[in-house]
């Protein structure tokens, strides 16, 4: 039994890191393999992650971690019984994929303005809380070409757009994702989408 693709890990910069790897043949990850991990820290202890299958030869492990700080470094040991298959390390702050924003809501009762709000996925004491920026994706269910992205580069988790920038009388969906420039993170997954019917009063034509 050998590792074909070494484990690569990403952290949510809070409490979970996800490691994926591939073996050289079909493997029952949960019965045959164990990923041991330990924070390099005086008061830490070793933990064991039981991997799940991720395709025939692929394995994935979800590592429960202490609250992350930038200096953290974890040792990783992949075992098959008594055989050490791979040894490595992982710095969560260098491989961050933020959590997805939540609670996306479209407020349509503010005159002819659409107000989209969502929740920051981090608690205020987490470093990423004040460093996330967002992308909001709005698309029409009726017209695949009507697809737009709004970049929200300020910290407030909200976006205002004029209802008239979208077509009236049809349904739209929106979703939002996050990233943090400070740690050069990847984008988060998209939030669950929310749907609304866009309608607004057409302005009277002037003759």
């Amino acid at each position: 039994m050998k590792v074909l693709q070494e484990p690569t890990c990403v952290s949510d910069y809070m409490s979970i890191s996800t490691c994926e790897w591939k073996m050289n043949g079909p493997t029952n990850c949960s019965t045959e393999l164990r990923l041991l991990y330990q924070l390099v820290f005086l008061l830490s202890e070793a933990h064991t992650c039981i991997p799940e299958n991720n395709g025939g030869a692929g394995c994935v492990c979800h590592l429960l971690m202490d609250d992350v700080v930038s200096a953290d470094n974890y040792t990783l040991d992949l075992w098959a019984g008594q055989q050490l298959l791979w040894k490595g390390s992982f710095k969560p702050s260098e491989h961050v994929k933020p959590r997805a924003p939540g609670n996306l809501t479209v407020h349509t009762n503010v005159s002819d303005t659409l107000l989209l709000t969502w929740s920051n996925p981090y608690p205020p004491d987490n470093y990423l809380y004040n460093h996330l920026t967002y992308a909001v994706n709005i698309w029409s269910e009726n017209d695949p070409a009507d697809f737009r992205i709004y970049n929200v580069t300020y910290l407030e988790p909200s976006l205002r757009i004029a209802a008239s920038t979208l077509k009236s009388g049809i349904s739209y969906r929106a979703r939002v994702r996050a990233w943090a420039q400070c740690y050069n993170t990847t984008w988060s997954e998209w939030s669950p989408s929310t749907k609304w019917h866009n309608s607004y009063r057409e302005p009277f034509e002037q003759h």
Epitope: F41, L42, S44, V69
Partner: antibody, heavy 115, light 109 residues
Framework: EVQLVESGGGLVHPGGSLRLSCAAS????????MFWVRQAPGKGLEWVSG???????SYADSVKGRFTISRDNAKNSLYLQMNSLRAEDTAVYYC?????????WGQGTLVTVSS | EIVLTQSPGTLSLSPGERATLSCRAS???????LAWYQQKPGQAPRLLIF???SRAPGIPDRFSGSGSGTDFTLTISRLEPEDFAVYYC??????????FGQGTKVEIK
């Protein structure tokens, strides 16, 4: 908002015992190492003890064998049991959250050891 | 045990002046594990700098940290009235644990 509130300080005779408590709120206590740091009157800061998320502990040489740190994750509380107290243990005792350094501190509780 | 020695013991300066505080370690310290704190009378310490040079959230940019190995520096570019306090450096070591310097008092001249 992160809050750490110490209690249990007071006047104790040399050789006596005292138990300090720290009530934590505003963060996930179970995922954080916790510490006690003290400061004698007019002196500098001295790290006393720390406890990891899994219960691993460490002590300064000056308190080893006399002090015991513990935590109760269900109650979001940190404790310091201090036995065989000496005059030189007189200090303000701070509860702190952190790891390699300490971003969050309580306001401290004063322990006075005197006959 | 790693010993941190801060100098000077007291720094007498006027508002608007630049303050340079030194912290010297008895053996090499990882920059990742070097921090600076500010403490005012009757208050708990406040983290200013971690990782030798990263400002903690909410700390004004007049505070900066630098250094590596055994020599570290905290600089306050222009002293404000609220900056007069005692400053401590602190290190962490995987085997020796946590130690603080003895402090530098920055007082009004």
């Amino acid at each position: 908002e992160v809050q750490l509130v110490e209690s249990g300080g007071g006047l104790v005779h040399p050789g006596g015992s005292l138990r300090l408590s720290c009530a934590a709120s505003g963060f996930t206590f179970s995922r954080n190492a916790m510490f006690w740091v003290r400061q004698a009157p007019g002196k500098g800061l001295e790290w006393v003890s720390g406890i990891g998320t899994g219960g691993a502990t460490s002590y300064a040489d000056s308190v080893k064998g006399r002090f015991t740190i513990s935590r109760d994750n269900a109650k979001n509380s940190l404790y310091l049991q201090m036995n065989s107290l000496r005059a030189e243990d007189t200090a303000v005792y701070y509860c702190a959250r952190g790891r390699y350094y300490f971003p969050w501190w309580g306001q401290g509780t004063l322990v006075t050891v005197s006959s | 045990e790693i010993v941190l020695t801060q100098s000077p013991g007291t720094l007498s300066l006027s508002p608007g002046e630049r303050a340079t505080l030194s912290c010297r370690a008895s053996q090499s310290v990882s920059s990742s594990y070097l921090a600076w704190y500010q403490q005012k009378p009757g208050q708990a310490p406040r983290l200013l700098i971690f990782g030798a040079s990263s400002r903690a959230p909410g700390i004004p940019d007049r505070f900066s940290g630098s250094g590596s190995g055994t020599d570290f520096t905290l600089t306050i570019s222009r002293l404000e009235p609220e900056d007069f306090a005692v400053y401590y450096c602190q290190q962490y070591d995987h085997s020796a644990g946590w130690t603080f310097g003895q402090g530098t008092k920055v007082e009004i001249k």
